[in-house]
């Protein structure tokens, strides 16, 4: 069971300081941006992180959404990352959900965050380069200290 608490507006960056945004095709991508670029590209660079209380003491459960014309929420259904047109629900009556991730700080690096899928244990949001694009993907943690699964989250409230 997950019960929604509160939400905050955030900018999410990878460890190369690239900013996460949602492109015109609704794809979550990372791109180099100045602070003014980031502001100019809002609301596509501003993510709504909604926090949930979890019925199991596993960590801070969150959903990640974006509001452009409508609200879309990040999903890892079938281990594929996509934004689905939906509001973060008030309650989720299950112990796993494709839209719930556990946001945890990296041990020894309180400002660096990881997002583990509640549906797929050991799988994390990650940044991966594919041709000329830096994509947000779901990746199994295969090595300690993997920088691709670490992010910074800057509150914009």
């Amino acid at each position: 069971y997950f019960g929604k608490l509160e939400s905050k507006l955030s900018v999410i960056r990878n460890l190369n300081d690239q900013v996460l945004f949602i492109d015109q095709g609704n794809r979550p991508l990372f791109e180099d941006m100045t602070d003014s670029d980031c502001r100019d590209n809002a609301p596509r660079t501003i993510f709504i992180i909604s926090m949930y209380k979890d019925s199991q003491p596993r960590g801070m459960a969150v959903t990640i959404s974006v509001k452009c014309e409508k609200i879309s929420t990040l999903s890892c259904e079938n281990k594929i990352i996509s934004f689905k047109e939906m509001n973060p629900p008030d309650n989720i009556k299950d112990t796993k959900s494709d839209i719930i991730f556990f946001q945890r700080s990296v041990p020894g690096h309180d400002n660096k965050m990881q997002f583990e899928s509640s549906s797929y244990e050991g799988y994390f949001l990650a940044c991966e380069k594919e041709r000329d694009l830096f994509k947000l993907i779901l990746k199994k943690e295969d090595e300690l200290g993997d920088r691709s699964i670490m992010f910074t989250v800057q509150n914009e409230d």
Epitope: Y1, L5, E6, M51, K53, D54, S55, Q56, P57
Partner: antibody
Framework: QVQLQQSGPRLVKPSQTLSLTCTVS??????????WSWIRQPAGKGLEWIGS???????YYNPSLKSRVTISGDTPKNQFSLKLSSVTAADTAVYYC?????????????????WGRGTLVTVSS | DIVMTQSPSTLSASVGDRVTITCRAS??????LAWYQQKPGRAPKVLIY???TLESGVPSRFSGSGSGTDFTLTISSLQPEDFATYYC?????????FGQGTKLEIK
């Protein structure tokens, strides 16, 4: 009403494993609705949650101690146990077992509502 | 982890006084906060959960308030048995974390 009774060695040598058991009376650890938890308190200091176990056997640990902690349950004996490996003097503390109401959308949850009396465990050679 | 900061660390008061202890969370925890009382050599005892709900059997002189990051525990009229150490605790997000404690002593 539910009562928790703790047992285990009060002196542990450095690098060894600290082991404590909590026996539950007046209720069953297998009935659901509660987590069964361990908390510790170094002398003159604050409280630290170590971890919890659910009736299903699922365990949840404080990340700061996770690599050294094992919590297990023994349903027939109505007991749950703590093992903390590779102890040092910094692990010297009063160790408490406690009951924790589980969260399923209700308010009365995730605090420690019934406690054992506590066991002072000293790590020393 | 969510850091809970209590103030003051020590509070001197007299029987009959109204006292307030404050607790601040390092990030918003909605109303998911508990208050515990601990006397020397004893296990802690829960007084309040969900920021303001009194646990069964706890005297009504204890009350809690707050939401988000700022919380208070108030004892409306101190009784001799209330001199103890009080802890706030984050019960929103694991790992469950406690404040460093406020020792309430006799003036």
């Amino acid at each position: 009403q539910v009562q928790l009774q703790q047992s285990g060695p009060r002196l542990v040598k450095p690098s060894q494993t600290l082991s404590l058991t909590c026996t539950v009376s007046g209720g069953s650890i297998s009935s659901g609705g509660y987590y069964w938890s361990w908390i510790r308190q170094p002398a003159g200091k604050g409280l630290e949650w170590i971890g919890s176990i659910y009736y299903s056997g699922s365990t949840y640990y404080n990340p700061s101690l996770k690599s050294r902690v094992t919590i297990s349950g023994d349903t027939p004996k109505n007991q749950f146990s703590l093992k903390l490996s590779s102890v040092t003097a910094a692990d010297t503390a009063v160790y408490y077992c406690a009951r924790t109401p589980a969260y399923f959308g209700q308010d009365r949850t995730d605090f420690f509502d019934v406690w054992g009396r506590g066991t002072l465990v000293t790590v020393s050679s | 982890d969510i850091v809970m900061t209590q103030s003051p660390s020590t509070l001197s008061a007299s029987v009959g006084d109204r006292v307030t202890i404050t607790c601040r969370a390092s990030q918003g925890i909605s109303s998911w906060l508990a208050w515990y009382q601990q006397k020397p050599g004893r296990a802690p005892k829960v007084l309040i959960y969900k920021a303001s709900t009194l646990e069964s059997g706890v005297p009504s002189r204890f009350s809690g308030s707050g939401s988000g990051t700022d919380f208070t525990l108030t004892i409306s009229s101190l009784q001799p048995e209330d001199f103890a150490t009080y802890y706030c605790a984050n019960i929103a997000f694991p790992p469950w974390t406690f404040g460093q404690g406020t020792k309430l002593e006799i003036k």
